[in-house]
């Protein structure tokens, strides 16, 4: 970037720079056309009569240097060849020179400082690459110079510029003095304010743009060269905070739009809210759950938020005795999460309706929580009792919801208990067509025995088919029309109210070979 | 502000010559263009030539070749026109006319002429 | 010589119109053209040089656009002192030559 010093180009009064020695021949300020066909100020010398070795100085007004340690001065020049020149002395030039004065004010005067080198530093001789020329019979035609100096370091408050003819023919047209500095920066989110460089190179620290941290240390810099360049080289070290993302090409931190959101420092983009969540405000960090809807603790930020799970479905149970099957569906809804389980919560109802949490000498397997197979079974259930058993799905989320979680209900009543197994068979009697049996009464738990069912069958012959039964009202029964000393297998179970009890342990009786032994009494 | 200040009226004998002056006061002279234009009576302007004084040669229009002389004297910062063989046609006021800018300080030469002297008034008759 | 072509010759019009003046030139000229006023007895005044450029201290009702062989010069309103004689002038060549003049008279 160049910041302008003084551009005579831009100014519309009279320049009145300061001309010596005062005499004939001096430059002089002149209205001038420039390329864009713009009036100008200039000033022209072309004394062809002077005596020789008389100087003609040209001095600018004082220019504050702002900082400036470096001023450059281009200036476009005209100049006539001293060869189209008729009545041009061996003394003509093609050239002039550039000198400089430092002071802290403007305190130059018409006389001072003494007009030479010394005090004033000589920049440059600058020689036209055109010159003007007029060829007979022809117009003259020429060219504008443009010539770039270089001045300083400079280091007082501000400087003149001062132009020496010593026998060119020639016009300023227009003088442009200026610095080079690096404009203001921002690039990769970090920002490098303008930098006049003071010498070849100069290292600028930056900042951090609105709403992004740094991410490194030491803070980011950059070099600003004399060139007023910045120098090439990768910035890193800011990043934009959570909330925010970078935007138009990394040089601002934009705040994340509703309904989007961004969870940690990076370069990452703002992202839309996950499922079930929302952000009503621009710059979210995080997406708020819509009600009803949770984060577990473990959650990342950028997961979807979830609810409990709807009820299981469809309980059925499977009664055995003293042990019950419980299964059931999947729930309709699994609340949008992975680690669904079921747990299982027995209560035990009287008639009149109280209910009481079930006894301790009941044992779920695999166990009453935390299942992740939709089954358990329970065993030590007492016989002509209501148990209601509510099957609940629960994942990561229940424990925030507000409420009990969804069950799905399941009454079982369990039945009155049967009468223990009949065993202690005794043959009374046997023929070779027929056994007598007997056998001890049971205990019935639940009323008296109503009666007994027999269940035999040739030992070796154990098909559906072969297997006969026999009920009886006593304690005893004759089995008839068997096989002449054949063996058989025997099991009896008896029935009350409460239905029929387990069959006992198979007896092994044997029918008599011939009629002689028939009724033969015998014991088992 | 320049003035260009010019010789005064003249009459003349037809065949005989005519030197009009043109003095410019204050500052630059040798780098601008002096034009010279004649006017008739009732009739439009016609361009006779020109000289940038440096150079000291000059341009001339044609129809006034090999009769029109154009000088400049740097050291007086005047220009002159002489004509000569003069008819009854050329009886008009004579101008003098500078250039708006120097040679030196235009980047196009539009050699527009914003100065004009008073006119000189030549009157060729018998 | 290039020829300069001015028209119309003369022209009557009333203060406040539009007046525009045309010069033809007889080749190229780029916009090497210049625009003069002139009063009786009086020198002629510069109004436009590089076909557009208006002349410092010129009123800006003057206006003058062109480039090649055809250039306009217009008054955009007119007032009672722009009543007077508007030539063009040429100076592309090393020989300038000016048209023959536009006399604008009050109707």
């Known amino acids: 970037l160049e910041e302008t010093l003084l551009n005579t180009k831009l100014e519309t009064a009279d320049l009145k720079w300061v001309t010596y020695p005062q005499a004939e021949g001096q430059w002089e300020e002149l209205s001038g056309l420039d390329e864009e066909q713009h009036s100008v100020r200039t000033y022209e010398v072309c004394d062809m009569k002077r005596p020789g070795g008389q100087a003609h100085w040209l001095r600018t007004g004082w220019v504050p240097r702002r900082g400036a340690v470096h001023v450059y001065a281009t200036i476009r020049f005209t100049m006539m060849e001293c060869l189209s020149l008729p009545r041009a002395s061996r003394s003509c030039k093609e050239t002039f020179t550039v000198f400089y004065y430092e002071s802290e004010a403007d305190t130059a005067t018409a006389h001072t400082p003494a007009w030479m080198e010394n005090p004033y530093i000589k920049v440059d001789t600058v020689a036209a690459e055109h010159l003007t020329r007029k060829r007979p019979g022809a117009e003259a035609t020429g060219k504008v110079n443009i010539k770039t100096l270089r001045l300083g370091p400079l280091s007082k408050a501000g400087f003149y510029l001062a132009f020496q003819d010593q026998g060119a023919c020639m016009a300023l047209l227009s003088l442009h003095l200026f610095y080079k500095k690096c404009s203001w920066l921002i690039t990769n989110l970090t920002y490098f304010p303008e930098t006049v460089p003071r010498e070849l190179v100069v290292p600028v620290a930056g900042s951090c743009v609105a709403n992004a941290v740094p991410t490194a240390n030491p803070s980011p810099s950059l070099y600003c060269r004399e060139d007023g360049q910045w120098a090439e080289q990768q910035v890193t070290g800011c990043s934009c905070a959570p909330g925010y993302e970078a935007a138009e090409s990394n040089k601002v931190c934009r705040a994340c739009g509703q309904g989007t959101f961004k969870p940690q420092i990076g370069d990452e983009s703002c992202l839309p809210c996950p499922a079930n969540s929302h952000s009503n405000n621009i710059g979210s960090p995080v997406c708020l759950c819509r009600i009803g809807y949770y984060r577990a603790r473990s959650d990342p930020r950028s997961s979807p938020c979830t609810t409990p799970p709807s009820a299981p479905r469809s309980v059925v149970h499977h009664l055995n005795g003293s042990t019950l099957r419980l299964e059931w569906s999947a729930p309709l809804e699994s609340g949008g999460r992975e680690d669904l389980t079921y747990a299982v919560r027995c209560r035990e109802c009287r008639p009149g309706g109280s209910c009481l949490p079930c006894g301790g000498d009941m044992t779920f397997d695999p166990g009453p929580r935390d299942l992740v197979e939709p089954w358990v079974a329970i065993r030590g259930l007492r016989p002509d009792v209501t148990y209601t058993f509510e099957v609940a799905a629960l994942n990561g989320v229940s424990t925030l919801a507000t409420g009990p979680p969804p069950f799905e209900p399941v009454n079982v009543t369990t039945d009155r208990e049967v009468p223990p197994a009949v065993s202690d068979i005794r043959v009374t009697r046997s023929s070779p067509s027929s056994l007598i049996l007997s056998w001890a009464i049971p205990r019935a738990p639940s009323g008296a025995v109503l009666d007994y069912e027999v269940k035999y069958h040739e030992k070796g012959a154990e098909g559906p088919s072969s297997v006969r039964f026999l009920k009886t009202s006593e304690n005893r029964a004759e089995l008839r029309g068997l096989k002449r000393g054949a063996s058989y297998l025997v099991q009896v179970r008896a029935r009350s109210e409460a239905g029929y009890g387990p069959f006992g342990q198979e007896h092994h009786s044997q029918t008599q070979l011939d009629e002689s032994e028939s009724w033969r009494e015998q014991l088992a | 502000q320049v003035q260009l200040v010019q010789s005064g009226a003249e009459v003349k004998k037809p065949g005989s010559s005519v030197k009009v002056s043109c003095k410019a006061s204050?500052?630059?002279?040798?780098?601008?263009?002096i034009s010279w234009v004649r006017q008739a009576p009732g009739q439009g302007l016609e361009w006779m030539g020109r000289?940038?004084?440096?150079?000291?040669?000059?341009n001339y229009a044609q129809k006034f070749q090999g009769r029109v002389t154009i000088t400049a004297d740097e050291s007086t910062s005047t220009a002159y026109m002489e004509l000569s063989s003069l008819r009854s046609e050329d009886t008009a006021v004579y101008y003098c006319?500078?250039?708006?800018?120097?040679?030196?300080?235009?980047?196009?030469?539009?050699?527009?002429?914003?100065?004009w002297g008073q006119g000189t008034l030549v009157t060729v008759s018998s | 010589d290039i020829q300069m072509t001015q028209s119309p010759s003369s022209l009557s019009a009333s203060v406040g119109d539009r007046v525009t003046i045309t010069c033809r030139a007889s080749?190229?000229?780029?916009?090497?053209l210049n625009w003069y006023q002139q009063k009786p007895g009086k020198a002629p005044k510069l109004l436009i040089y590089?076909?557009?450029i208006l002349q410092s201290g010129v009123p800006s009702r003057f206006s003058g656009s062109g480039s090649g062989t055809d250039f306009t010069l217009t008054i955009s309103s007119l007032q009672p002192e722009d009543f007077a004689v508007y030539y063009c002038?040429?100076?592309?060549?090393?020989?300038?030559?000016f048209g023959q003049g536009t006399k604008v008279e009050i109707k």
């Open positions: 006319a500078r250039s708006s800018y120097t040679i030196l300080t235009t980047y196009y030469n539009y050699n527009a002429m914003d100065n």
């Open positions: 204050g500052g630059t002279f040798s780098t601008y263009a």
């Open positions: 000289i940038i004084p440096i150079f000291g040669t000059a």
């Open positions: 080749q190229n000229i780029n916009n090497f």
């Open positions: 590089g076909s557009s």
């Open positions: 002038h040429q100076v592309s060549d090393t020989s300038d030559t």
